[in-house]
Amino acid sequence: TLNSVLNSNAIKNLPPPLGGAAGHPGSAVSAAPGILYPGGNKYQTIDNYQPYPCAEDEECGTDEYCASPTRGGDAGVQICLACRKRRKRCMRHAMCCPGNYCKNGICVSSDQNHFRGEIEETITESFGNDHSTLDGYSRRTTLSSKMYHTKGQEGSVCLRSSDCASGLCCARHFWSKICKPVLKEGQVCTKHRRKGSHGLEIFQRCYCGEGLSCRIQKDHHQASNSSRLHTCQRH
């Protein structure tokens, strides 16, 4: 269980005083049962550990992904785990470290030479064998072979937000993902009522920009739950 992570939960790196920024302590681990170490395949207990809970990958760092730390773990307990290096097992692109992507359950390099064909195949595979289309658009999506070598501009195909230029995030568009603008004040945003609901969106929105949060528009408070409009608002 997750709790075995915390059997020895002392923090050796004492936090700084109020307002100070802490360093990023390493993912040092010591042996013990029950926990899948984020970067590999061995069961270990994590010591000196500060679990950072999350609901989706965007809440974690660029070198992390969001998942349950135990196999078959409680969906209500998800934390940021270290990304998986090349040749490690994966279930989605975000699990693989930047410069890699998930192909056939393994993190592989997204280097320029073989990236284009493989990622095209992977995106098609990701959505199963149903080859139907929506509004005449094909599910097969080709990525530029220059990806990962320059930051994607708006509309560029991406795997994760770190592939996109500043002010953009990587969001689903049909059955691929492209760089879209981070939402500004007053723009409509999506408030996910339950974990994982964002996975159903064909046209996914970015999150609200810094200093903003996705909240119900004041004049929509009386509306029914299903019709409530959320917008990015300042605190």
Epitope: P15, L18, G19, G20, A21, A22, H24, P25, Q50, Y52, P53, C54, A55, E58, E59, C60, G61, T62, D63, E64, G76, V77, Q78, I79, C80, R160, S161, S162, H192, R194, K195, Y207, E210, G211, L212, S213, C214, H235
Partner: nanobody
């Protein structure tokens, strides 16, 4: 820069309850995870509980699971720690911590970068 102020600590008898609060200011509260840590005299600081930015994921230390509950109110920029069935071994200074917001703020790793000054909790037997 984030500022965190804890309150709600005090002296309570074993078996009693306390509710700690941590008010945050200085950045969009709803963008980052929040955690509670504690440090008993002569011991190292240890993790107690944490909650994701959307409140959909919570995690607890073994020693407090089933007794403590973490929650947050994003509208009030406040995180809470409800502590029930308190034991003498829960005596410590309790610290509130705010995460760095992860990749949304350009970080390679999501970590607790901001800390409050702490509030004393004493449980007498």
């Amino acid at each position: 820069e984030v500022q965190l102020v804890e309150s709600g600590g005090g002296l309570v008898q074993a078996g009693g309850s306390l509710r700690l609060s941590c008010a945050a200011s200085g950045r969009t509260f709803s963008s980052y995870a929040m955690g509670w840590f504690r440090q008993a005299p002569g011991k190292e600081r240890e993790f107690v509980a944490a909650i994701s930015s959307s409140a959909s994921s919570t995690v607890y230390a073994d020693s407090v699971k089933g007794r403590f509950a973490i929650s947050r109110d994003n509208a009030k920029s406040t995180v809470y720690l409800q502590m029930n069935s308190l034991k003498p071994e829960d005596t410590a200074v309790y610290y509130c911590a705010a995460g760095n917001g992860g990749r949304k703020y350009g970080h390679h790793r999501a970590r607790y970068d901001y800390w409050g000054q702490g509030t004393q909790v004493t449980v007498s037997s």
